[in-house]
């Protein structure tokens, strides 16, 4: 029995097999910063993690999901001030006793070196240099993301 996320993933993969991709042809919305195939919006105000999650949702986006260390570094390179912390879309799941991304996947322990405890009511923030576990009630800034949608052209035989 596949989860809805897994089903969606399979559908996307099948779609990709039938199409060619031309990524980067669609631009980020105004005021969003392009970072590779994502658009990022860094908040100006502070909020607890739940409110940050909700704000991104109202912007038809999500809290930042970081695929790997390379993406973390590139995101951190956009942050000018060492002292500013930003929520991302990762929090501690008490039931599964693990760090869980808001898309339902679990953190690969090699991806992020987290400073602080993995415990109830802990959420993850990033700074220019580090990744921190913070109380989810802490009011800090946050980063929303939108995925850039590749423009796909159908591949036709002999075209």
């Amino acid at each position: 029995q596949k989860s809805s996320i897994e089903k969606c993933s399979v559908d996307i993969q099948q779609s990709r097999n039938k199409t060619t991709e031309r990524p980067g042809l669609l631009n980020c919305p105004i005021y969003w910063q392009q970072l590779r195939e994502k658009c990022l919006l860094f908040s100006h105000t502070v909020n607890p993690w739940n409110n940050s999650l909700a704000d991104c949702s109202t912007k038809e986006s999500s809290l930042l999901l970081i695929r790997d260390k390379d993406e973390l570094i590139h995101t951190q390179n956009l942050i000018r001030d060492k002292a500013i912390l930003f929520w991302i879309g990762l929090n501690f799941s008490l039931s599964e006793k693990n760090w869980k991304w808001i898309n339902g996947s679990f953190l690969n322990s090699n991806d992020l070196e987290i400073r602080g405890d993995a415990k109830e009511n802990s959420c993850i923030s990033i700074s220019q240099t580090s990744v921190y576990s913070e109380y989810c009630s802490t009011e800090i800034r946050w980063i929303c993301q939108k995925e850039l949608t590749p423009v796909r052209n159908k591949v036709y035989p002999d075209s």
């Epitope: 105004i30 005021y31 910063q33 100006h44 912007k59 000018r80």
Partner: antibody, heavy 118, light 107 residues
Framework: QVQLQESGPGLVKPSETLSLTCTVS????????WSWIRQPPGKGLEWIGY???????NYNPSLKSRVTILLDTSKNQFSLKLSSVTAADTAVYYC????????????WGQGTLVTVSS | EIVMTQSPASLSVSPGERATLSCRAS??????LAWYQQKVGQAPRLLIS???TRATGIPARFSGSGSGTEFTLTISSLQSEDFAVYYC?????????FGGGTKVEIK
């Protein structure tokens, strides 16, 4: 009371670089977007560009090759450099805070007239 | 770039009367439109953002409407301090662009 104050020379020679600084008080520049806007005498407003508090910039394509905007968080200032100026760059230059997707420039400096003349 | 066209270029109105100012965008800017008031020798002042939301401290006699390409700023009952130049500005696309302004004069 949030205040923005432009400073810099009021007279610049043709082909030289116009340099202005905006000092922000009562609010940190570690938020929002910080823009430069100009207004030639008796004419309308033209957006020059902004610097985002994380350090990225965006410039008006009509001026992009000549513009640099920098941020100095330690002094709570941002600055404008416009190279290779001509008489057409004579204008009142304003610095302003841009609210981004929330919309509009909500705080402005009082403006400084820069004349390009030999 | 998106060209913002304001009309009329000037408007003569008596104090207490209603003034209606128009702004047209060369392509849709959704609701990403702001209005400013500028008096002689002063910086512009933000009146309206999001096409219809009054900025902090702006009197209720100022109202904005419209979306897409057609926008209106209405001053319901002109006061002496309202005689000024009014600019619209779009923030839906780069570069940010302003209209040419409408001068509201005393009749």
């Amino acid at each position: 009371q949030v205040q923005l104050q432009e400073s810099g020379p009021g007279l610049v020679k043709p082909s030289e670089t116009l340099s202005l600084t905006c000092t922000v008080s009562a609010v940190s520049i570690n938020s929002y977007y910080w823009s430069w806007i100009r207004q030639p005498p008796g004419k309308g407003l033209e957006w020059i560009g902004y610097i985002y508090y994380i350090g990225t910039t965006n410039y008006n394509p009509s001026l992009k090759s000549r513009v640099t905007i920098l941020l100095d968080t330690s002094k709570n200032q941002f600055s404008l450099k416009l190279s290779s100026v001509t008489a057409a760059d004579t204008a009142v230059y304003y610095c302003a805070r841009d609210l981004g997707i929330e919309g509009g420039f909500d705080y402005w400096g009082q403006g400084t007239l820069v004349t390009v003349s030999s | 770039e998106i060209v913002m066209t304001q009309s009329p270029a000037s408007l003569s109105v008596s104090p207490g009367e209603r003034a209606t100012l128009s702004c047209r965008a060369s392509q849709s800017v959704s609701s990403s439109l702001a209005w400013y008031q500028q008096k002689v020798g002063q910086a512009p002042r933000l009146l309206i953002s999001g096409a219809s939301t009054r900025a902090t401290g702006i009197p209720a006699r100022f109202s904005g409407s419209g979306s897409g390409t057609e926008f209106t700023l209405t001053i319901s009952s002109l006061q002496s301090e309202d005689f000024a130049v009014y600019y619209c500005q779009q923030y839906n696309n780069w570069p940010l662009t302003f209209g040419g302004g409408t001068k509201v004069e005393i009749k």
